[in-house]
Interface confidence: low
């Protein structure tokens, strides 16, 4: 399978996975009219924008994404989201209210696909194996993250969104323990009472007990 024809960028290695550099190709003149007769996006926005859901990275400290991948994806998003553009609705569409922020005849592959280094076509990511969350010219999909043994899957990896992992019940991860899940505290220190249960991204919360009764 393949996709939106686009200029295949020069390959550059990104931590062992081959990717096409996504570079704005702006110029002094305006873009050609879009298929809807509207004026195209501004020069600075021509590289394309994210049109699918963002991956769950950074949504909360309880969600983990491999740091290397996180940097790769953020790098892609930073280069792909430099401007906004008028949304172009697809004619005669029977798949709900999906909207395009780039022309159907655009220069980037859509989210959920990547640029074939050999044919120049857009190849779909394999569900559960790889994903791309933004319009791109990457030469391979970003590999789906596998949850660690102390984690559980919050949402499965799709073609457009990475796996979301969270700590298993009874454990949590916060900014202080970003790399591993820690066991939740079993109770509050003497003189404090529990006001919030443990969640995958925070330990129990304890506050001072004004009456002096504490829980162990």
């Amino acid at each position: 399978a393949s996709g939106t024809e686009a200029a295949t960028a020069t390959p550059s290695k990104v931590w062992g996975s081959s990717a096409g550099r996504i570079e704005p190709r702006g110029g002094g003149r305006g873009a050609l009219p879009t298929s809807m007769g509207q004026q195209g996006p501004s020069a600075q926005a021509r590289a394309g924008r994210v049109v699918g859901p963002r991956s769950a990275q950074g949504a909360s400290p309880g969600l983990r994404v491999h740091k290397t991948l996180k940097f790769v994806v953020v790098g892609v998003l930073l280069q792909v989201v430099p401007g906004s553009a008028a949304t172009i609705k697809v004619h005669d569409q029977s798949v709900g209210t999906q909207q395009w922020e780039h022309s159907p005849l655009g220069e980037l592959c859509p989210p959920g696909s990547h640029r074939s280094e050999h044919s120049g076509a857009c190849n779909q990511c394999t569900e559960g194996v790889g994903y791309t969350s933004a319009s791109n010219n990457l030469f391979s999909c970003l590999p789906c993250t596998a949850c660690k043994s102390d984690e559980e899957e919050r949402s499965a990896c799709t073609r457009t969104r990475n796996t979301a992992c969270q700590c298993k019940p009874g454990t949590f991860r916060n900014d202080d323990s970003a790399e591993m899940c820690r066991k939740c505290s079993t109770g509050c220190p003497r003189g404090k009472v529990k006001v919030k249960d443990c969640t995958p991204w925070s330990d129990i919360e304890c506050v001072h007990n004004e009456s002096g009764n504490g829980h162990n």
């Epitope: 393949s2 024809e5 110029g27 305006g30 050609l32 159907p104 220069e107």
Partner: antibody, heavy 121, light 118 residues
Framework: EVQLVESGGGLVKPGGSLRLSCAAS????????MHWVRQAPGKGLEWVAG????????YYADSVKGRFTISRDNAKNSLYLQMNSLRAEDTAVYYC??????????????WGQGTLVTVSS | QPVLHQPPAMSSALGTTIRLTCTLR?????????VYWYQQRPGHPPRFLLR?????????GPQVPPRFSGSKDVARNRGYLSISELQPEDEAMYYC???????????FGSGTQLTVLS
Amino acid sequence: EVQLVESGGGLVKPGGSLRLSCAASGFTFSTYGMHWVRQAPGKGLEWVAGINYSGNNKYYADSVKGRFTISRDNAKNSLYLQMNSLRAEDTAVYYCARDHSTWLSRHLDYWGQGTLVTVSS
Amino acid sequence: QPVLHQPPAMSSALGTTIRLTCTLRNDHDIGVYSVYWYQQRPGHPPRFLLRYFSQSDKSQGPQVPPRFSGSKDVARNRGYLSISELQPEDEAMYYCAMGARSSVTHVFGSGTQLTVLS
């Protein structure tokens, strides 16, 4: 070998209808976008309509919007163009073309031989 | 004024090199676009020749010899198709097309008729 064979062309009166078909073979039809491109006698190429691999997304030239409908049947390896409210200016050879990709691009890598549609009273 | 302009006709002698021009209207920037070229011989359907964005980013059509090559002049807002060692069978109509956020109603240029002089 990739082959695209158009059929369904012919003589039709203004205001009439016609349905063009394109039989595809020699490739996995369901993984490619497809287009209809026409060429009026002695004129240049004009893109008419395009459809992505699954048939979910369809695009039309302004000149045919609301009158023509592109569709596909992946089980039958076939592409269609339903043409209603035909006008004299729709007279042309209609080519079926395969897109290089799943979605739609400028890269039309294989073309059929075309079928002639004549709209005349 | 059309978005894409091609001279209606050009000619060159057998064995020479010719460069066909596709000019993008000057309120648009060819630096952003890939330029596509199609050949149509008399009585035949069009044939995809090549796509050109830059020297490091281009693709040749199936069975298209390297005599056919693309280039761009961003300053002049033009795309070019060069054909070297002209042969009789190169006599055809050549159409350019632009890729990117282009209006789908302006996919193809008006075409250039190439005549090969013997």
